[in-house]
């Protein structure tokens, strides 16, 4: 009652291996690191036969094929290329994942190489079974922003793609009778998150009141450059708005607030995000330039009160931009309580100007980001949100304009975006 | 075309409480806020408040806080506005209005012992 | 609070003249960013609810006649009717929203 000698599948083993096998002896099919038991269209890791009582096995040799892990899954804002030859899914071929560059980069800089494992699982070194993550990458437009010294009010021109996180805001409050309309800027923080300022996104008619305007009275548009033709921007409206909960209507201190997207919006040559920068509450140091763009009023011939009086748009049509010295605390304090009036710069603010005035922001430009660049990371950084400026007209000699010190505000920036009250689960670059 | 119609004339004694009632057609009431003045003989005109009925937000006068408390019922586009501690300074007109526009028809409130 | 000054506090015209009446605030109703004075103007007559005229200071409400005209930005506002109709015999209040809302004391018109 002898079975008939066993020969092992190829890239597999019989155990145990005996020259004689008798009635009731069992044997243990496996395969090699790499290869499963196919049997009957069905996979497994060992399969085990019997010799029976008239001398025949109770089932054939299975044979012993190769792991695949299958077509590796997509990756959000990435692509996958295989580095085996015909695109090869088995055991031990590669694939590598990469972001789409230069508009996003792999969190935790690892290699995007992953190897098909024996489990029949793509498996990175460091990242094991999970796919990488590819985030915005902030702070480096696609032109470099030039050296030039240019001015919002009296300014020449931006350049499409200077400021890619520029957001300009429109609100239309329809709950008063009539609408109030009003615009502002913002800055792109990630694909869903844009960055501004609190009194942008209160209701106007009250004014010492803080009513966040509704959600849906807010659009957003990223990626303007020419406020005449919006044909090329994407316009998103908001799921959420968040103000600052202490912002304080008499003295805009912590003018500071958030605006959700209803969807995320596709990053490109003209829409990127902007950096935060690091929690500390030096804020940006005296001298250091920054730049502000906006689409706020550009003619400097043209005081404040007579483009409100005259009804015209405050808009400039084409985006302005202006470069900035950051002005010390102790001076910028000095000039305002030189003033009449109760003007109060708080540590929650910075000043930027020239002490001869020329160059400034102005109304319009309210909840843009003023950035500067870090030399350490390369990027450009969200020091500061347009606030306010004194009674005199923008850029008067003197009158620095005031912004919000963004720095104090990372921990709180940090905490509302990855909220559970946040629309969705978004990764943030931090 | 946009109106509000307020509940009828009310005589109350010191000390009660009083709910009045705006309810409005002709246009999405949860959008629009609501407002709420008192008209007294030689008086003029006060401000008591306002509420946005989609979102219940409120905003009162100060004079009128303790005094005034706002709700809205969207279901049946009413507006109410309660009146508590009566006493006979609180006897006048009371207008619902439509942020700046429509007003309402007006309640008498009578506050005598 | 914003305090609104109304004068005169009465005037008598005969029909068809033109009347002007003032409106001062306590400070300013121009809103810069919307570019709008908070100021409306309303009518209200004998036994009935007031009646929006103008808002904006200067904007005329769908259907009021064109006699009736809103003037002034910052802190001083006049209603001006070009000329004075039996049916504008009414009591004029103006109203601030720029912020927690107050009325002027009110001009009432009377024709001779």
């Known amino acids: 009652n002898e079975c008939p000698k066993l020969q092992p599948p190829v890239y597999g083993k019989i155990e145990p291996s005996q020259a004689v096998y008798s009635f009731k002896d069992q044997v243990l099919v496996s395969c090699d690191t790499g290869y499963k038991v196919l049997k009957d269209n069905g996979v497994m890791d060992t399969f085990q036969i019997e010799c029976l009582k008239d001398g025949a096995w109770s089932n054939k040799i299975p044979t012993c094929k190769i792991v695949d892990c299958g077509a590796p899954a997509g990756l959000k804002h990435g692509l996958v290329t295989f580095s085996t030859r015909n695109n090869l899914t088995t055991y031990k071929s590669e694939i590598r994942y990469s972001c789409q560059q230069p508009y996003y980069k792999m969190l935790h800089n690892t290699t995007g190489v992953y190897t098909c494992s024996a489990h029949g699982t793509w498996t990175n070194e460091v990242l094991k079974r999970s796919l990488p993550t590819c985030l915005p990458v902030c702070g480096q437009p696609s032109r470099a922003l030039p050296n030039l010294v240019k001015r919002i009010i009296g300014g020449r021109n931006a350049e499409l793609g200077l400021f890619p996180w520029q957001a300009l805001i429109v609100v239309e409050d329809t709950s008063r009778v009539p609408n109030d309309k009003w615009f502002g800027s913002g800055a792109l923080l990630s694909e869903s998150w844009i960055l501004t300022a609190a009194h942008v996104l209160r209701s106007q008619r009250r004014d010492n009141t803080v009513i966040p305007v509704s959600k849906e009275h807010v659009t957003v548009y990223l990626g303007l450059h020419d406020v005449r033709d919006k044909s090329g921007a994407v316009n998103s409206s908001a799921a959420r708005v968040i103000l600052h909960p202490d912002f304080n209507i008499q003295n805009y201190n912590h003018d500071i607030a958030l605006v959700q997207l209803q969807k995320p919006v596709p990053l490109g040559a003209h829409v990127m995000p902007i950096c935060l920068p690091r929690p500390e509450p030096e804020g940006p140091a005296p001298h250091m330039l920054g730049l502000v763009a906006g689409w706020g009023i550009s003619n400097p011939n043209v005081t404040v009160d007579e483009i409100i009086l005259s009804g015209t748009r405050t808009l400039s049509d084409v985006l302005q931009y202006v470069k900035l010295p950051v002005v010390s605390h102790a001076e910028c304090k000095a000039s305002y309580e030189s003033r009449s009036g109760n003007y109060s710069v708080t540590e929650n603010m910075f000043c930027a100007g020239y002490y001869e005035g020329g160059k400034d922001t102005c109304l319009g430009d309210s909840g843009g980001a003023f950035v500067i660049f870090d030399e350490m990371s390369q990027h450009w950084v969200a020091q500061g949100l347009v606030s306010w400026g004194g009674p005199e007209e923008c850029g008067s000699k003197q009158v620095y304009g005031v912004y919000t010190k963004v720095s104090n505000y990372v921990d709180w920036l940090w905490e509302e975006m990855n909220s559970p009250r946040a629309v969705r689960d978004l990764q943030v670059e931090r | 075309q946009v109106q509000l119609k307020q509940s009828g004339a009310e005589l109350m004694k010191p000390g009660a409480s009083v709910k009045l009632s705006c309810k409005a057609t002709g246009y999405t009431f949860t959008g629009k806020w609501i407002e709420w003045v008192k008209q007294r003989p030689g008086h003029g005109l006060e401000w008591i408040g306002e509420?946005?009925?989609?979102?219940?937000?409120?905003n009162y006068n100060e004079k009128f806080k303790g005094k005034a408390t706002f709700t809205a019922d969207s279901s049946s586009n009413t507006a109410y506005m309660q009146l508590s501690s009566l006493t006979t300074e609180d006897s006048a007109m009371y207008y619902c209005?439509?942020?700046?526009?429509?007003w309402g028809t007006g309640t008498t409130v009578t506050v005598s012992s | 609070d914003i305090v609104m000054t109304q004068s005169p506090s009465s005037l008598a015209v005969s029909a068809g003249e033109k009347v002007t009446m003032s409106c001062k605030s306590s400070q300013s109703l121009l809103n810069s960013r919307t570019r709008k004075n908070y100021l409306a103007w309303y009518q209200q007559k004998p036994g009935q609810s007031p009646k929006l005229l103008i808002y904006?200071?200067?904007t005329r409400e769908s259907g009021v006649p064109d006699r009736f005209t809103g003037s002034g930005s910052g802190t001083d506002f006049t209603l001006t009717i070009s000329s004075v109709q039996a049916e504008d015999l009414a009591v004029y209040y103006c109203k601030q929203s720029y912020n927690i809302p107050t009325f002027g004391g009110g001009t009432k018109l009377e024709i001779k």
């Open positions: 209005l439509r942020s700046e526009d429509v």
């Open positions: 904006w200071a200067s």
């Open positions: 509420i946005l009925p989609g979102t219940g937000s409120t």
